[in-house]
């Protein structure tokens, strides 16, 4: 089909400009030279193309760069970034934080979590580690995006950078991510005094082991219930009633509200009922008085 492949002489494109918005898809495909498009990508986002037309331009770039776009093109994608799939982005090598900022601005408020996560991943790979400048950029332009990184990528965060992370940046982090970040935070804040240390370490406590939670219970920190509920189940279960009481301080009354929710429910099931009764909260479900507890897992390990 000649119409598909041949550009009419009067439609030949010598520069990327606003006249192109009047080209049909087929004319864009036939008349826009991919190398010219790549060289003048900085003009594209200022031109009021439809996304239908941007799809054609993307197709041209894909043909020119089957192994992935160079950063000179990526930096100027603008709204064309909304047409990129995670598979497209995985091919990129991005090192510039200006590129990251530009694309985070475009994607702000859109359902692009997979694309943004992949982009951030490529930046971390490109820069070699998750350095302070990258973390600062993420916290400024994409709160919560830190948690889109895999535990493997987060492991490249130097402890010195942890101080730049704000509590809200960790809101969407899962246990596996906090498992990686917590030891770094512990190291980063180790020279702080008790109360100051607790304020800093609190957002990371979802990755804390039992020993560290027990240690906190000796420091009069008065942990709030929200933080307690985010602790790892495995870290909470071995705590005694007395330790939980000291850990929560005046907030211990909140256990009643969370009685049916993990990890509180699971912790109650492991405590003696008469120990729970000492709290005076009416918590029910503990081990009845006079019952013997056999830990079969220990027996199996011995046999």
């Amino acid at each position: 089909d000649v119409e598909r492949t041949t550009c009419p002489p009067e439609k030949e494109v010598h520069e990327i400009d606003e006249s192109l918005i009047f080209y049909k898809k087929r004319e864009l495909e036939a008349c826009v030279d991919a190398a010219l498009l790549a060289a003048q990508m900085d003009r594209v986002d200022a031109i009021p193309f439809t996304y239908e037309q941007l799809d054609v331009l993307k197709h041209k770039l894909d043909e020119l760069y089957p192994q992935g776009y160079p950063e000179s093109v990526i930096r100027h994608l603008g709204h064309l970034f909304l047409k990129m799939s995670p598979e497209d982005i995985r091919k990129w090598n991005v090192t510039s934080l200006e590129t990251l900022k530009a694309l985070l601005k475009v994607s702000k408020g859109h359902e692009m979590s997979a694309q943004v996560a992949t982009l951030i991943d490529r930046v971390v790979v490109g820069r070699g580690q998750l350095d302070k400048d990258t973390v600062d950029t993420l916290t400024a332009f994409c709160p919560g995006c830190l948690c889109s990184l895999s535990p493997e990528r987060l492991s490249s965060v130097p402890p010195s950078v942890i101080g730049a992370v704000r509590p809200q940046d960790l809101d969407t982090c899962g246990p596996r991510q906090l498992d990686v970040l917590y030891p770094k935070a512990r190291l980063a804040f180790q020279n702080m005094s008790g109360s100051e240390y607790f304020v800093k370490i609190r957002p990371f406590l979802g990755g804390a082991p039992t020993e560290d939670v027990k240690a906190l219970s000796q420091q009069n920190v008065s942990m709030d219930l929200a933080t307690f509920m985010k602790l790892r189940r495995e870290a909470v279960l071995p705590l005694t009633v007395a330790e939980v009481q000291k850990l929560l301080g005046p907030h211990v009354e909140g256990l009643k509200v969370e009685e049916q929710h993990s990890p509180v429910r699971d912790w109650i099931l492991k405590q003696r009922q008469d120990d729970l009764d000492t709290l005076g909260l009416g918590l029910q479900g503990g081990i009845p008085n006079g019952y013997l507890i056999l830990d079969l897992s220990v027996r199996e390990a011995l046999s």
Epitope: P48, F49, T50, H79, G109
Partner: nanobody, 116 residues
């Protein structure tokens, strides 16, 4: 999602005029203003005129001097005044816009037929 409803199409003789309207069911947040497009049978859709968010207007060479795009923000309506119509202007006319999320929106279209 905001609905786009075109009206004003019809049959007109060469040299005649029509005024198309595009009413939106609410405020639109467009990346590229509002456009009037047309599609003739067997052809691809093409942009005829566009009015950007700042009021700037743009026209295809084939309609310059004959068509005028305008809008009334108080009525959430965009217009296309078409004068000196020619047989080659025969097509289904659509209004449309692109949001900030990666999607184009179109109305259902209104038929314009220029015939003697």
């Amino acid at each position: 999602q905001v609905q786009l409803v075109e009206s004003g199409g019809g049959v007109v003789q060469p040299g005649g005029s029509l005024r198309l309207s595009c009413a939106t069911s609410g405020t639109i947040f467009s990346r590229n203003g509002m456009g009037w497009f047309r599609q003739a049978p067997g052809k691809q859709r093409e942009l005829v005129a566009r009015i950007l968010n700042d009021g700037t207007t743009m026209y295809a060479d084939s309609v310059k001097g004959r068509f005028t795009i305008s809008r009334d923000n108080s009525k959430n309506t965009v217009y296309l005044q078409m004068n000196s119509l020619k047989p080659e202007d025969t097509a289904v006319y659509y209004c449309g816009y692109s949001d900030y999320r990666g999607t184009d929106y179109w109305g259902q279209g209104t038929q314009v037929t220029v015939s003697s």
